[in-house]
C-alpha cells in the first residue's frame, strides 16, 4: 500500500577545502532556469566522485544551496552562481537545506482532519 | 534517466562537411550540459566539444578548433556538432554525453568522468 510522502527540511553549515580538482560537484537553478517549480534557488546536481564534495560526504545531489561564504544565493541568474563558486577560494563554506522523504502512513488511514489529497 | 541518441555520421571525403546531431530524451533538456568525444581505432577517447545549457559557452578541442561547432536547440531536445574541412584524423566513433547541471569547477568539461549519460556513438570515417 503506498503511503502519503512528505519531507523533512533541515539545515546544515558544511566547510570544504577546495581539492586538486576543485569542489567537486554540479548545480542547476537560477532566476533563468529554474529547478524546482516556481523556485529559483540552487540546486545540488551531481557530486562527483572522489571529489571534495564526496570526500566530505555531507552534501548530496538535492540539496539546496543557501549561501556561500555567507553569500545569499536568491535571484541569481546560473552562471553567476556558478561564478560564486568558481572564485569562492580554498575554503568554502556553504549553507544547504537537507530535503529528506519521510513516509508518512498508508493512504486509506488519514486520521480526521487529515486533508484528502 | 537520459537517453541520447546520436545520428548523421558517414563515409566523407577529405575537405567535406557533417552534421552530427545528438536527440536527448528522459529529463528535462535545458538542465544538461552536452559534450561530444571521439573514440578513433586503437586509440583513447578524446574530448571534442562542449556546451552548457543554454549554448551561451561552447569549448572546443584544439584539434578542432575553429572547424568544428558544436550548437543547441533546446526547443528540439537536439545538439549538433557541424565539422567542417575534415580529415582523415578525424576518422572516429563520435560520442554525445550529458551531465546534468553545470561543473562548479574549472576545466571539467574535457573530463569524460564529468559525464553521466553516453549514447552508442555515430561512425564517421574521412577517407
Known amino acids: 500500500m503506498n503511503g502519503r510522502v512528505d519531507y523533512l527540511v533541515t539545515e546544515e553549515e558544511i566547510n570544504l577545502t577546495r581539492g586538486p580538482s576543485g569542489l567537486g560537484f554540479n548545480i542547476v537553478g537560477g532566476t533563468d532556469q529554474q529547478y524546482v517549480s516556481n523556485d529559483s534557488g540552487i540546486y545540488v546536481s551531481r557530486i562527483k566522485e572522489n571529489g571534495a564534495a564526496a570526500l566530505d560526504g555531507r552534501l548530496q545531489e538535492g540539496d539546496k544551496i543557501l549561501s556561500v561564504n555567507g553569500q545569499d544565493l536568491k535571484n541569481l541568474l546560473h552562471q553567476d552562481a556558478v561564478d560564486l563558486f568558481r572564485n569562492a577560494g580554498y575554503a568554502v563554506s556553504l549553507r544547504v537545506q537537507h530535503r529528506l522523504q519521510v513516509q508518512n502512513g498508508p493512504i486509506g488511514h488519514r486520521g480526521e482532519g487529515d486533508p484528502s489529497g | 534517466d537520459v537517453q541520447l541518441v546520436e545520428s548523421g555520421g558517414r563515409l566523407v571525403q577529405a575537405g567535406g562537411s557533417l552534421r552530427l546531431s545528438c536527440a536527448a530524451s528522459?529529463?528535462?533538456?535545458?538542465?544538461?550540459?552536452m559534450g561530444w568525444f571521439r573514440r578513433a581505432p586503437g586509440k583513447e577517447r578524446e574530448f571534442t566539444a562542449h556546451?552548457?545549457?543554454?549554448?551561451?559557452?561552447?569549448n572546443y578541442a584544439d584539434s578542432v578548433k575553429g572547424r568544428f561547432t558544436i550548437s543547441r536547440d533546446n526547443a528540439k531536445n537536439t545538439v549538433y556538432l557541424q565539422m567542417n574541412s575534415l580529415k582523415p584524423e578525424d576518422t572516429a566513433v563520435y560520442y554525445c554525453?550529458?551531465?546534468?547541471?553545470?561543473?562548479?569547477?574549472?576545466?571539467?568539461?574535457?573530463?569524460?568522468?564529468?559525464?553521466?549519460?553516453w549514447g552508442q556513438g555515430t561512425q564517421v570515417t574521412v577517407s
Open positions: 554525453a550529458a551531465t546534468l547541471g553545470d561543473s562548479v569547477d574549472l576545466d571539467s568539461d574535457a573530463d569524460p568522468r564529468g559525464y553521466d549519460y
Open positions: 528522459g529529463r528535462t533538456f535545458t538542465h544538461l550540459n
Open positions: 556546451i552548457n545549457w543554454s549554448g551561451g559557452s561552447t
